[in-house]
């Protein structure tokens, strides 16, 4: 009976240093197999003693055509089990197998970590035929190895729908430590502890970490990767980096700046964009944020007037946009305006103060003692009033606006007249007879039109009626006077 010899496949431990059945090389490793005697390669790296049972999948060949003798089971010959080399070196390794000539169309494929290697790989298969068997040597070469070439490589051969698999060849590419996590720049609160993390990998392992703060080593002894540095607090900006060491050498991380959060710098360039009688639109350029986002800003407004009590009005606003409309101001007044902004640490100093003025306002009171009477001979209405007691902020009086509304039998018509500031009387032509005329007067400044006086009504009779009694607004009452004829 034919028995199948098998052995437990044990994974090779991945640690630096030569292993039984391993090749450590820092030069080009060319496991070349010249054709010397028949198909037997001359140079083989064998981790096993002679006569060691073969491993991997074995194909049990069928009986020969004559039916007289059995062929030995097919298996790949043992080769080097573990190749250790430095990054950027070249490596070549191979599988070999002797296949009886009765088998046709034998192909060998290379696999890495369970995936077939296809395409642009340097795989060469050479055949060395003999009388009864053909030696097949499949070579795989990698130029300038990288870490990504690390892994377990095997050969597979299909024969009669059977698959023969070689022992794995472990390729371990060693190099300088490679950072998988580096410290990050941060903005921190003064005298408050924070953490930085550094992680680097080989192979070779172990990777040891040294922390550097402002060019001074923080830890005198190496710490295993990954390492978390608890910085006990800073009073000023500092630069941190970490050094990763392994047997191949040293890699230094990027240096990161740790900033200390502070109050913001004051805003600059406070500008006036628009002024009205009661509002001023300002903008500003934010100062440096102190390594902490702005939360809000405060607009401070002081009236520049020797008679004012010097109190400051404060208007809070969001930090963005850098613009604010100050409202509820007095007309024709001078103000000093400053801006301050805050972050989580506190308020900035106030910006340089700027002067701004509101424009003239409209009058706030109506003309007084409005009287209206009919001058029938001239067919007009005489209107008289007293100049209102306007505040300085309303600006200079430029005139008056007279509104007269004529109402009769379902018809209503409003007319407006403008008169100069020196006048305190006006005459308007009668528009309609047998009608009511309602008169209101407002003072006008550059700032606008003030409130209209209370309406004064006068009845305009049909032709032939004579009455010179005036209608008037009492001063200062708010009755609705009507001339009763």
């Amino acid at each position: 009976a034919i028995t199948e010899a098998r052995e437990e496949a044990k994974p090779y431990p991945l640690f630096p240093g030569p292993l039984p059945g391993s090749l450590q090389t820092d030069h080009t490793s060319l496991l070349s197999l010249p054709h010397t005697s028949g198909y037997q390669p001359a140079l083989m790296f064998s981790p096993t003693q002679p006569g060691r049972p073969y491993t991997g999948n074995v194909a049990i060949p069928r009986v020969t055509s004559a039916g007289s003798k059995l062929l030995p089971p097919l298996a790949f010959k043992h080769t080097v089990g573990h190749i250790i080399l430095s990054e950027h070196k070249d490596v070549k390794f191979n599988c070999s197998i002797s296949v009886p000539n009765i088998y046709q169309d034998t192909t060998i494929s290379w696999w890495k970590d369970g995936k077939e290697l296809l395409g642009a790989h340097h795989a060469i298969t050479q055949f060395y035929p003999d009388d009864e068997v053909t030696a097949i040597i499949a070579s795989f070469s990698i130029t300038s190895v990288q870490r990504s070439d690390n892994g377990s490589y095997i050969c597979k051969m299909k024969i009669n729908n059977e698959e023969i698999v070689s022992d794995p060849i472990y390729i371990e590419v060693q190099g300088l430590p490679h950072f998988t996590k580096q410290p990050e720049s941060m903005n921190v609160t003064r005298n408050t502890a924070f953490n930085l993390t550094c992680q680097a990998v080989g192979p070779p392992e172990p990777v040891n970490i040294f922390w550097v703060q402002n060019s001074s080593r923080v830890n005198e002894q190496p710490e295993k990767s990954p390492s978390v540095l608890t910085v006990p607090g800073l009073t000023e900006m500092a630069v941190f980096s970490c050094e990763a060491h392994n047997d191949k050498g040293l890699t230094v991380s990027k240096g990161v700046q740790i900033n200390i959060k502070a109050i913001p710098s004051p805003p600059t360039e406070v500008s006036i964009h628009n002024s009205t009688a009661h509002s001023i639109l300002i903008s500003w350029v934010p100062g440096f944020d102190g390594y902490s986002p702005f939360r809000n800003c405060s607009v401070q407004v002081k009236e520049v007037d020797p008679l004012s009590n010097g109190s400051v009005m404060i208007f809070n606003t969001s930090a963005s946009p850098h613009m604010y409309q100050i409202k509820q101001l007095q007309a024709l007044a001078n103000y000093s305006i400053g801006v301050s902004c805050m972050n989580e640490i506190g308020w900035s100093a106030v910006s340089p103060w700027i002067l701004a003025s509101t424009t003239e306002g409209a009058p706030s009171v109506a003309p007084l003692n409005v009287t209206v009477f009919l001058n029938e001979s001239r067919d007009n209405v005489d209107i008289r009033w007293m100049k209102p007691l306007t505040k300085r902020q309303a600006g200079e009086l430029v005139g008056y606006r007279i509104s007269h509304v004529w109402q009769s039998a379902g018809i209503s018509k409003e007319l407006l007249e403008e008169v100069g500031q020196n006048n305190s009387r006006a005459q308007i032509s009668v528009q309609v007879h047998n009608a009511t005329c309602t008169v209101r007067i407002a003072a006008v400044t550059k700032g606008g039109v003030g409130p209209f006086s209370d309406p004064v009504k006068i009845f305009i009779p049909a032709h032939g009626w004579v009455d010179h009694a005036p209608s008037s607004t009492p001063a200062p009452g708010n009755a609705d006077p009507v001339l009763i004829i």
């Epitope: 402002n214 001074s216 540095l229 006990p232 607090g233």
Partner: antibody, heavy 118, light 106 residues
């Protein structure tokens, strides 16, 4: 708990040698350096240097080179300070300390008094 | 070598009083550690990295400072606080100690 236990007091003649031991317990010995600090009678603390317990490499402060040797036996978590050709001015209490990040000495031995007198 | 100068050399105070100890460095240092030593005893860690209390140290002790100027403050002296206090710098080798400040009972 972390402990550093030093060997007992020594009385030596000038020209002799002395070896002070410092046995560490309660932590992984090779993770922290061992520093040595001298305190002469009535004087302040003077840093002598330290030994890297991971590599065995010693670092000596100025004035402590030549006659002073730091060594280790990691198998028994012990650091040693050896002083040769002793002089009267070597009379002092010698402390071993555990060094951590930022050169902070967080644990101290109880001190070993070395008296050099003829 | 960074030289650390502690002042005053001696501070005479009564229990309950506030003690302010100064340590000046000849050039800027990253952190300052403080140790307390009583007669016949080994030094004991007090303040780590300028302002962090070592384990078991009461809150009446505090540390502050930056650059070349560092301070240890004891807000209200207790009888057990009368001792010698040393500062020690971290920045560059060698690791130097200050000359010490003795806090004695007035």
């Amino acid at each position: 708990q972390v402990q550093l236990v030093q060997s007992g007091s020594e009385l030596k003649k000038p020209g002799a040698s002395v070896k002070v031991s410092c046995k560490a317990s309660g932590y992984t010995f090779t993770n922290y350096g061992v520093h040595w600090v001298r305190q002469a009678p009535g004087q302040g603390l003077e840093w002598m240097g330290w030994i890297n317990t991971y590599t065995g490499e010693p670092t000596y402060a100025q004035g402590f080179t030549g006659r002073f040797v730091f060594s280790l036996d990691t198998s028994v978590s012990t650091a040693y300070l050896q002083i040769s050709s002793l002089k009267a001015e070597d009379t002092a209490v010698y402390y071993c300390t555990r060094g951590t990040r930022y050169a902070y000495m967080d644990y101290w031995g109880q001190g070993t008094l070395v008296t050099v007198s003829s | 070598e960074i030289v650390l100068t502690q002042s005053p050399a001696t501070l005479s105070l009564s229990p309950g009083e506030r003690a302010t100890l100064s340590c000046r460095a000849s050039s800027s240092v990253g952190y300052m550690h403080w140790y307390q030593q009583k007669p016949g005893q080994a030094p004991r860690p007090l303040i780590y990295a300028t302002s962090n209390l070592a384990s078991g140290i009461p809150a009446r002790f505090s540390g502050s400072g930056s650059g070349t100027s560092y301070t240890l403050t004891i807000s209200s002296l207790e009888p057990e606080d009368f001792a010698v206090y040393y500062c020690q710098q971290w920045s560059s080798n060698p690791r130097t100690f200050g000359g010490g400040t003795k806090v004695e009972i007035k």
